[in-house]
């Protein structure tokens, strides 16, 4: 009987084992098939080429006061995606802007050498020949061209010949329009902020990025011009000259833009000095925009060396005059306001000088000199109200020059001396020029970099010239790289676990089954 009983229990055990093994086998088989299919599906739909093919691009920003070279890189397979291009290098060319080389064009080649050699080092040699180089000149060269087209053309010709000597794919040097400068700045910041992306994100990695797709306006301040660009609420414009239409990533944008030539911070200062010296009783100009105790001699010939001061030009009974700082924000502000003609407006609303400006809409990124100046003054925080900024400016401007020099020993005196004027000018331009208010001030975000890339027109310029901003939403890979990696790892783990369980089941002794029954 005992033997029969043992046999029956063995049969039972065998039946259970067969039944379990069949079920487990089915489950394991099904799981591994699902995992393999998922791996193939994710891998094939993502179609990510490895190793990644990296492309580079170079843009030179030939500004009025200096030239900067920017190097950008991006994965070749993703060049139509949003936010994939990022800056890897910025090289500031030693010396003034290229327009200052008009009487010494033969020196331009040497001037550009250091930064072009730096680009040669940063970009892998194998990529040199396919790396495009663009040079865009802005308001400094626009002003030179107003004086003489030939002079501006000669400078650009020497620049082109110099840049053609490098192993890169030189695509030309040109003076970009004020409209382009504004538009490309707007494209840059919205591209970097992810505003053109139609994908919903699991998390945000950009500090200013919001869940909505409302674009940011762009406020750009240079040495010789300033630009304002944004999407107004009302899509019909009173001034076609200030209207731009874009179709980017499948969406239409009606953009307002204007560039105010001569209203960059350096040219605005020359304008203010030329205006104020008209009423000076002698060769001393007591100036509220400079710190008390500050003194500087200015040549009258230098004052009138720009088309921006022509409207104030007059014969003065002296060749030189001395600026003597008195450091009074309120008086400086008043003096600056006289640069903005607000008495004439042929539209429903104007900025200044009879230029149409629609009502401000949304958030604004203020970059370039807006950021540099406000950052120096420690006023870029989102928490600082307009009233606080004004208070800080009053305090800063009234500080004696000797004290300022001691406090900021590492800063070049030429730049240091002008922060009081520049800060006051920025406030005047934003509040009285563009009609920001104490309330709307909180919508201005002073931005230096976004995800490591400088805010400015250069990135937008390159994206446009390399056709990396499609009009329609591209048929992009359906998953972000991080999601793709996560799913690949997950399904690989499922396969590994299935394999381990399978091995355990089919290579374990019979007591494994006893324990299970």
């Amino acid at each position: 009987m005992k033997g029969t009983k043992d046999l029956t229990s063995q049969q039972k055990e065998s039946n259970v084992k067969t039944f379990c093994s069949k079920n487990i086998l089915a489950i394991l088989g099904f799981s591994s098939i699902i995992a393999v299919i998922a791996l193939l599906a994710v891998g094939l739909t993502q179609n990510k080429a490895l190793p990644e093919n990296i492309k580079y691009g170079i843009v030179l920003d030939a500004g009025s006061s200096h030239t900067s070279l920017y190097i950008y890189k991006w994965p070749a397979e993703k060049e139509n995606d949003t936010g994939v291009v990022h800056q890897v290098e910025e090289c500031r060319v030693k010396g003034p802007g290229i327009s200052k080389y008009v009487q010494k064009v033969n020196e331009i080649g040497i001037y550009l050498t250091d930064c072009m050699e730096r680009a040669r080092e940063v970009i892998p040699r194998s990529q040199h020949q396919e790396t495009p180089v663009y040079l865009g000149a802005t308001a400094g060269m626009r002003l030179l061209r107003m004086e003489s087209e030939e002079l501006a053309d000669r400078v650009l010709d020497v620049v082109e010949r110099s840049l053609s000597n490098y192993p890169f794919d030189f695509q030309g040097a040109r003076i970009i329009t004020g409209q382009e400068e504004g538009a490309y700045g707007w494209i840059t910041i919205n591209y970097l902020l992810g505003k053109f992306s139609q994908k919903t994100r699991w998390f945000s990695i950009v500090p200013y990025e919001t869940n909505n797709q409302e674009t940011f306006g762009a406020l750009d301040l240079g040495g010789a011009s300033t630009q304002i660009t944004f999407v107004p609420q009302n899509q019909t414009t009173e001034s076609p000259d200030n209207a731009l239409q874009f179709r980017l990533y499948g969406k239409d944008y009606n953009v307002y833009t204007h560039s105010f030539l001569c209203y960059g911070k350096d040219q605005a200062l020359w304008q203010k000095l030329a205006k104020d010296i008209q009423v000076a009783s002698n060769e001393i100009l007591r100036d509220p925009c400079f710190h008390p105790g500050y003194k500087k001699v200015v040549n009258v010939s230098d004052l009138y060396k720009t088309p921006c001061t022509k409207r104030f030009e007059m014969t003065l009974p002296f060749q030189q005059f001395e600026i003597q700082g008195i450091g009074n924000y309120q008086q400086c502000h008043q003096s600056v306001l006289e640069l903005f003609n607000t008495s004439y407006c042929p539209y429903s609303q104007c900025a200044f000088n009879g230029i149409f400006l629609p009502p401000l809409q949304g958030d604004f990124g203020a970059f370039s000199a807006f950021y540099f100046v406000m950052n120096f003054l420690n006023l870029t925080s989102e928490k600082v109200s307009q009233e606080k900024v004004t208070e800080m400016m009053k305090k800063f401007c009234s500080q004696p020059w000797e004290e300022i020099k001691t406090s900021y020993a590492g800063v070049k005196e030429k730049y240091l001396s002008e922060y009081c004027f520049s800060g006051t000018y920025i406030l005047s331009l934003l509040l009285q020029g563009y009609h920001f208010t104490a309330d709307s001030w909180e919508h201005i975000h002073f931005i230096g970099k976004i995800q490591g890339s400088d805010a400015g027109w250069t990135l937008g310029y390159m994206l446009n010239l390399t056709n990396m901003i499609p009009a329609e939403q591209p048929l992009s890979t359906p998953l972000s790289h991080s999601t793709y990696v996560f799913l690949m790892v997950l399904f690989s783990l499922v396969l590994v676990i299935v394999a381990i369980i399978g091995l355990l089941i089919f290579h374990k002794p019979s007591y494994f089954w006893k324990d299970m029954v």
Epitope: E147, E149, E150, L151, A152, D153, P307
Partner: antibody, heavy 123, light 106 residues
Framework: EVQLVESGGGLVQPGRSLRLSCAAS????????MNWVRQAPGKGLEWVSS????????SYADTVKGRFTISRDNAKNSLYLQMNSLRAEDTALYYC????????????????WGQGTMVTVSS | DTVLTQSPASLAVSPGQRATITCRAS??????MHWYQQKPGQPPKLLIY???NLASGVPARFSGSGSGTDFTLTINPVEADDTANYYC????????FGQGTKLEIK
């Protein structure tokens, strides 16, 4: 009507100096570059010197560099040419000429000319 | 200096015919070539600027063409009043003039 009137020419001995003036009217003087161009008797035209509208660019022909100085007084709508160390080969009719414009941009061609003032350098 | 060579040095054309004057630059001057007419005892008068643009008040009988190094001034048809010296001038580098072409009407 645009008018350019030169003065200051005359007979001068070699090595001496002379100052030519050009009085401009009929246009916004400080918006235009100005020039001196000369023409020796029976010969062709020779550019002497340029002064751009905002004094960004001042230049001279090699034949006069270091001896002649161009200047302008925008408030007086006047252009000047200070000529030092004069030579016999500087003998010519000296024209004051205005730079032209390509639309909104300045151009280094000459759209209006004065009648000229004669400079004779002889001992 | 950019040297400008005009040809011919002189030419005689009958009224109603076409007169063609050429100007060759020793180096490329883009389109920065200009043409002047000078009658005896008068200052030069601008005819053409930037290779092909007619100066204000100049009859459409005058036309200019060319770019780089080779430029042409054409007068078609020629009139008796066109007797004068004609000069080309480049402005790509510091200004230089051609040596002049004397046009006579037969």
């Amino acid at each position: 009507e645009v008018q350019l009137v030169e003065s200051g020419g005359g007979l001068v001995q070699p090595g001496r100096s002379l100052r030519l003036s050009c009085a401009a009217s009929g246009f916004t003087f400080n918006n235009y570059g100005m020039n001196w161009v000369r023409q020796a008797p029976g010969k062709g035209l020779e550019w002497v010197s340029s002064f751009s509208s905002s004094s960004t660019y001042i230049s001279y022909a090699d034949t006069v560099k270091g001896r002649f100085t161009i200047s302008r007084d925008n408030a007086k709508n006047s252009l000047y040419l200070q000529m030092n160390s004069l030579r016999a080969e500087d003998t010519a009719l000296y024209y004051c000429a205005r730079h032209g414009r390509y639309g909104g941009y300045g151009g280094f061609y000459f759209d209006y000319w004065g009648q000229g003032t004669m400079v004779t350098v002889s001992s | 200096d950019t040297v400008l060579t005009q040809s011919p040095a002189s030419l005689a054309v009958s009224p109603g015919q076409r007169a063609t004057i050429t100007c060759r630059a020793s180096e490329g001057v883009k389109s920065y070539m200009h043409w002047y007419q000078q009658k005896p005892g008068q200052p030069p008068k601008l005819l053409i600027y930037k290779a092909s643009n007619l100066a204000s008040g100049v009859p459409a009988r005058f036309s200019g063409s060319g770019s780089g190094t080779d430029f042409t001034l054409t007068i078609n048809p020629v009139e008796a009043d066109d007797t004068a010296n004609y000069y080309c001038q480049q402005s790509w580098n510091d200004p230089t003039f051609g040596q002049g072409t004397k046009l006579e009407i037969k």
